[in-house]
């Protein structure tokens, strides 16, 4: 039902869903800190623009007794319960921040008349693509898929002279929320990735993965998986790996690879790590002091959600436009705003664009080095290291099918 919004007469409220089920196991206190830091910045920016208005956040907590799994499995109902709570209290803000679980976002979007914008730190799945009033501030699965297809097809780089058309995907069902949806998108038979590949098989058992590493009859040299180096080690250990195997390890929200003292373990030499370009530095901010590098992106997305709202509010107020309109609800896309850590670009569908970075392990220095970057906004790859010190023969990535000549 239609809920009146606390969103006029110089007072603008943000409804923040504080859900027990979350894409990342981040204490809600840290997310509150991120939101509050964002509010301080927004208030300052509005004041500097001569706009004398009040901006606040209302944190809506769900009943932890009912929804207490902590992960996203029971989030579908939790999201709707929170919306019901908002409805009963007649306390809807101008914008809804949260949820982060794909299940809950999809269901909430489906079951409500969304005449207000919804900003999510998560909602990675393909089912949340192309939603008119949903903005996602962490890289969704679609962006990953487009990178992989672009990279597979690339054959004119000094270190990649073959197009690839095959892959194994390792997916055992224990993945984190982001990985679950990334791999789900690669697995889906109707997805862009599946459509563009000639051969793709999902490996679901540890043994299947381990057998492929030395199987002379394997159908592809390329294996995609998602997680951190420790996850790979648990699976691979110190097993021998055929010299033309390439493991692509998707680990987007982990900037530890860029830290000065990090040395790549030996088991990473056959691995290309796909991660996001690190932030300029969040280390000095009050909200990020308690965060691990892997959690920074999640809290930052909450903070940036507040800054995005402030950006849109400023534009609409300066233009004398009403905030409680479909126009406002549909405006959170195809724009660049000043995020906490620099400019943030949203595509035509409200999804964040970013620079993805593909790293390799230098056999000389045992350090992670940047091989190439990929700009999701323009779907373009930029080589960074033209003569990488790879483990692979001739310092070039092998063909994806053993024994097949140049493509």
């Amino acid at each position: 039902s239609q809920v009146s919004q606390n969103c006029h007469n110089g007072s603008y409220e943000i409804s923040v869903l504080m859900m027990g089920n979350s894409a990342f196991a981040e204490p809600l206190k840290n997310l509150e800190d991120a939101v509050n830091e964002g509010l301080e910045i927004v208030r300052g920016r509005l004041q500097n623009a001569g706009l004398n208005v009040t901006v606040n956040a209302t944190f809506m907590y769900s009943d932890g007794l009912i929804h207490n799994s902590g992960d996203c499995r029971s989030s579908t109902c939790e999201g709707l319960d929170l919306l019901r709570k908002i409805s009963n209290a007649q306390r809807m803000g101008c914008v809804l921040i949260g949820p982060s679980c794909t299940y809950s976002t999809f269901q909430m979007y489906l079951d409500t008349e969304l005449s207000y914008p919804m900003i999510s730190a998560g909602s990675f799945g393909l089912s949340c693509d192309y939603k008119e009033t949903l903005t996602r501030l962490m890289s969704p699965a679609r962006k990953l898929m487009y990178f992989l297809v672009n990279f597979w097809k690339t054959n004119d780089l000094p270190f990649k002279t073959y197009s690839w058309s095959t892959s194994y995907v390792y997916k055992n069902g224990t993945e984190t929320e982001d990985c679950f949806w990334y791999l789900n998108a690669l697995e889906a038979s109707v997805s862009y990735f599946s459509h563009e590949l000639g051969f793709k098989v999902v490996l679901r058992q540890d043994k299947e993965f381990q057998d492929i590493l030395m199987d002379h009859n394997r159908k592809s040299n390329v294996i995609i998986m998602c997680g951190g180096p420790e996850f790979l080690y648990k699976l691979k250990g110190d097993r021998a790996v055929a010299e033309d195997i390439v493991i692509i390890l998707v680990d987007l929200f982990n900037d530890q690879y860029f830290e000065d003292n990090v040395t790549a373990p030996d088991y990473m030499k056959n691995v290309l790590v796909l991660t996001l370009s690190p932030g300029n530095s969040l280390l000095n901010s009050s909200f990020s002091r308690n965060l691990s590098p892997t959690k920074r992106d999640f809290a930052l997305a909450y903070l940036n959600g507040i800054l995005l709202f402030g950006h849109m509010l400023k534009i609409f107020l300066e233009n004398g436009e009403n905030i409680t309109t479909p126009k406002f609800a549909h405006a959170f896309r195809n724009l660049t705003f000043e995020g906490y850590d620099g400019p943030v670009t949203l595509d035509d569908w409200g999804d964040v664009d970013s620079t993805m970075v593909l790293l390799y392990t230098s056999v000389d220095t045992k350090k992670y080095k940047v091989l190439l970057t990929y700009d999701t906004h323009v779907n373009k790859t930029y080589p960074v290291d033209m003569s990488p010190t790879f483990t692979w023969k001739n310092s070039k990535l092998p063909n994806d099918i053993t024994g097949r000549g140049p493509q």
């Epitope: 004119d156 000094p158 860029f258 690190p278 300029n280 620099g342 620079t355 970075v357 940047v370 960074v384």
Partner: antibody, heavy 117, light 106 residues
Framework: EVQLVQSGAEVKKPGSSVKVSCKAS????????ISWVRQAPGQGLEWMGG????????NYAQKFQGRVTITADKSTSTAYMELSSLRSEDTAVYYC??????????WGQGTTVTVSS | DIVMTQSPATLSVSPGEGATLSCRAS??????LAWYQQKPGRAPRLLIY???TRATGIPARFSGSGSGTEFTLTISSLQSEDFAVYYC????????FGGGTKLEIK
């Protein structure tokens, strides 16, 4: 509008080292490549190496490998190029240039380095 | 290294006329080619990247074409400020520059 301001001219003895700085102002520093290009008197342009400050590690042209070190300080938006074991043929104008990877859209004013005994 | 060869070394043209500068790569560089203009005592200035895309603020009389190994910079109607040295540069591999073409007033 991004500007790159380089340190002043240097006169060096053969065998010594020189360190040239390049300070960026008015735009994004960290996520662009900063390249160093030199030009000997009356000659063409020669790429020495580059760094993307946000990633930290530099890449070098084969010819300069082991003799050049490129670094960047994100906190001051400054890149540095140090060339060691100088010889007379290193006499040149040294430019820093900001690029979208390896084409260069903004250039510093150049720093003249003279190597002479 | 990829060797870039520019021709001619010197080109004499009258103001108002057009000029065509050539650049050849020793192996394919796809469309990863840039053109620069340099005047005496000044830093180079980016004109074209991606073989044919004009950089910000570059007049429409400058155009680039080609891909693979053969590239051309065309200046349609020469102004007095266009007389300078022009360099091509590939960035398909570690960057290398051509030797330059000096465009002088006839």
């Amino acid at each position: 509008e991004v500007q790159l301001v380089q340190s002043g001219a240097e006169v060096k003895k053969p065998g010594s080292s020189v360190k040239v700085s390049c300070k960026a102002s008015g735009g994004t520093f960290s996520s662009y490549a900063i390249s160093w290009v030199r030009q000997a008197p009356g000659q063409g342009l020669e790429w020495m190496g580059g760094i993307i400050p946000i990633f930290g590690t530099a890449n070098y042209a084969q010819k300069f490998q082991g003799r050049v070190t490129i670094t960047a300080d994100k906190s001051t938006s400054t890149a540095y190029m140090e060339l060691s074991s100088l010889r007379s043929e290193d006499t040149a104008v040294y430019y820093c240039a900001r690029g979208h990877y390896y084409y260069m859209d903004v250039w510093g004013q150049g720093t003249t380095v003279t190597v002479s005994s | 290294d990829i060797v870039m060869t520019q021709s001619p070394a010197t080109l004499s043209v009258s103001p108002g006329e057009g000029a065509t500068l050539s650049c050849r790569a020793s192996q394919s560089v796809s469309s990863n080619l840039a053109w620069y203009q340099q005047k005496p005592g000044r830093a180079p200035r980016l004109l074209i990247y991606g073989a044919s895309t004009r950089a910000t603020g570059i007049p429409a009389r400058f155009s680039g074409s080609g891909s693979g190994t053969e590239f051309t910079l065309t200046i349609s109607s020469l102004q007095s400020e266009d007389f300078a040295v022009y360099y091509c540069q590939q960035y398909n591999n570690w960057p290398t520059f051509g030797g330059g073409t000096k465009l002088e007033i006839k």
